[in-house]
C-alpha cells in the first residue's frame, strides 16, 4: 500500500501541521511559566484517509480493519511524527530558569 | 498535570491494548503472506480523556486546546507507545522467507 | 555546560568595520524561542543593547545604531557575528554576547574589549 | 524608546542591612524588568526577572518589587560580596534598555 501525501478530501482536508495561537492562560501554564506569554503550538490535525501517511505497518492493519469493522476499530490518526524543541522560562523553587522541552511542539504529521 | 491511569468514563472505556483476530484475507495481505493465516492484531483502542495516559507536553497541550476550542483542536489519540515484532512467513520473487516486522503489533498505548 | 566567548580585533582605526564572533556551545540556536544578543559596555558606564537574532533568523536592533549594525549566525559551527560599520572613538567599549531564551539573559560571555584609536 | 532612570548613582551601606535599589520607568512595562549584578572586573549576572522572580541559584537576600513604571531591588542582609553595580533592564519592547546603573558600596 502507497502510503501517500495525495488528500482524497481536498486539500488541507488531511492529516497536516497546523499552527495554533495560545495564551499561558489558554494552556494552563499561567502559574508556572514565565515566557513566552504566547506560544504558536504546532499540532497535527487532520483525517487520515485509507493509507494517507501511514506510519507504518501497524497504521496499514488499523486502515483495512477500520474498513471492515469501522464500530470497532477506529481510522487510524493525525499525530506528530516528530517535535521540535522549545524553551520555556519557568519558575522552579530554586528561582526562574531556562527549561527546553523536546515534545512540545510538532514537527511532522503521520497517521497511525 | 497527572498522566493518570484511572478512566473516568468508566471500566476499558479509555485508551488500551486490544486484541482484534483478523485473517489475512481481512489485512489484505493473501497474496503476499503464507503464515501465520491467522493473525491476533493488538491495537489501541478507546478515549483519551483529560491527562489520561499523556504521552508527552504535547498531548497535555492537545487537551487543554481541546477543551477551550473542542472544533478546531481534536482530543488526544489513543496510538501505540511501543510495538512488539512479528515474524511473517512471505512470498519473495526468489521464494519464500522469514521476515521479521517491528512496528506490527502495539505493545502498550498512550494519548498523543 | 553552557559558554559564550566573544573575539574581536582589539583595536581599530575611526571608519573601519568592527566584525564580532560569539562562539558557544552547551545549547542550540535552532530550538524555539533561543536567541543571542550582542550588548556593550564603554569603561565605567552602563550597558547598552546592540542587537539581537532568533533561533528563526528573525532580527532585532536598535534604531540609534541600526543602520550600521548586521547581525547574523552560523547555527551548525555556534556561533553569532555582529558587524559595526564605521567604527568611531565612541564605539570604544567592552562587548558581550549574551544568551536568551525569548527575553531571559542567563548567561554572559566573558566579553571582548574593542579600542578605537587614530 | 523607554527610559530607563536609575537617579542613585551610588549607594553606601553597612554589612548586615538593608539596601533598596530603583529604577523609574518612561512608561509602562508591566512586569516585564530584569536585574543584574555587575562586580568589578566581571561580566553582569542575572538575579531578578519579570520584576520578582529571582534567577536560579540567587539568595533569598535579593527580592525585586513593583509593576508599571516603578521597580525596587532590595538586598536586605548585606554582604560584603555584594559590593557591585546593579542595573534594572526592560524588555517590554524593542530597544530592551537598561538603566544607568546603581553603584553599591560596603561601608
Known amino acids: 500500500a502507497r502510503n501517500g501525501d495525495h488528500c482524497p478530501l481536498g486539500p488541507g482536508r488531511c492529516c497536516r501541521l497546523h499552527t495554533v495561537r495560545a495564551s499561558l492562560e489558554d494552556l494552563g501554564w499561567a502559574d508556572w511559566v514565565l515566557s513566552p506569554r504566547e506560544v504558536q503550538v504546532t499540532m497535527c490535525i487532520g483525517a487520515c484517509p485509507s493509507q494517507f501517511r501511514a506510519a507504518n505497518m501497524h497504521a496499514q492493519i488499523k486502515t483495512s480493519l477500520h474498513r471492515l469493522k469501522p464500530d470497532t476499530v477506529p481510522a487510524p490518526c493525525c499525530v506528530p511524527a516528530s517535535y521540535n524543541p522549545m524553551v520555556l522560562i519557568q519558575k522552579t523553587d530554586t528561582g526562574v530558569s531556562l527549561q527546553t522541552y523536546d515534545d512540545l511542539l510538532a514537527k511532522d504529521c503521520h497517521c497511525i | 498535570a497527572r498522566n493518570g491511569d484511572h478512566c473516568p468514563l468508566g471500566p476499558g472505556r479509555c485508551c488500551r491494548l486490544h486484541t482484534v483476530r483478523a485473517s489475512l484475507e481481512d489485512l489484505g495481505w493473501a497474496d503476499w503472506v503464507l503464515s501465520p493465516r491467522e493473525v491476533q492484531v493488538t491495537m489501541c483502542i478507546g478515549a483519551c480523556p483529560s491527562q489520561f495516559r499523556a504521552a508527552n507536553m504535547h498531548a497535555q497541550i492537545k487537551t487543554s486546546l481541546h477543551r477551550l476550542k473542542p472544533d478546531t483542536v481534536p482530543a488526544p489519540c489513543c496510538v501505540p507507545a511501543s510495538y512488539n515484532p512479528m515474524v511473517l512467513i512471505q512470498k519473495t520473487d526468489t521464494g519464500v522467507s522469514l521476515q521479521t516486522y517491528d512496528d506490527l503489533l502495539a505493545k502498550d498505548c498512550h494519548c498523543i | 555546560q553552557v559558554t559564550l566567548k566573544e573575539s574581536g580585533p582589539g583595536i581599530l582605526q575611526p571608519s573601519q568595520t568592527l566584525s564580532l564572533t560569539c562562539s558557544f556551545s552547551g545549547f542550540s540556536l535552532t530550538i524555539s524561542g533561543m536567541g543571542v544578543s550582542w550588548i556593550r559596555q564603554p569603561s565605567g558606564k552602563g550597558l547598552e543593547w546592540l542587537a539581537h537574532?532568533?533561533?528563526?533568523?528573525?532580527?532585532r536592533y536598535n534604531p540609534s545604531l541600526k543602520s550600521r549594525l548586521t547581525i547574523s549566525k552560523d547555527t551548525s559551527s555556534n556561533q553569532v557575528f555582529l558587524e559595526i560599520t564605521s567604527v568611531d572613538t565612541a564605539d570604544t567599549a567592552t562587548y558581550y554576547c549574551?544568551?536568551?531564551?525569548?527575553?531571559?539573559?542567563?548567561?554572559w560571555g566573558q566579553g571582548t574589549t574593542l579600542t578605537v584609536s587614530s | 524608546d523607554i527610559v530607563m532612570t536609575q537617579s542613585q548613582k551610588f549607594m553606601s551601606t553597612s554589612v548586615g542591612d538593608r539596601v533598596s535599589v530603583t529604577c523609574k520607568a518612561s512608561?509602562?512595562?508591566?512586569?516585564?524588568v530584569a536585574w543584574y549584578q555587575q562586580k568589578p572586573g566581571q561580566s553582569p549576572k542575572g538575579l531578578i526577572y519579570?520584576?520578582?522572580y529571582r534567577y536560579s541559584g540567587v539568595p533569598d537576600r535579593f527580592t525585586g518589587s513593583g509593576s508599571g513604571t516603578d521597580f525596587t531591588l532590595t538586598i536586605s542582609n548585606v554582604q560584603s560580596e555584594d559590593l557591585a553595580e546593579y542595573f534594572c533592564q526592560q524588555y517590554n519592547s524593542y530597544p530592551w534598555t537598561f538603566g544607568g546603573g546603581t553603584k553599591l558600596e560596603i561601608k
Open positions: 512608561q509602562n512595562v508591566g512586569t516585564n
Open positions: 537574532i532568533y533561533w528563526d533568523d528573525d532580527k
Open positions: 549574551v544568551r536568551a531564551g525569548w527575553d531571559f539573559f542567563d548567561y
Open positions: 519579570s520584576a520578582s
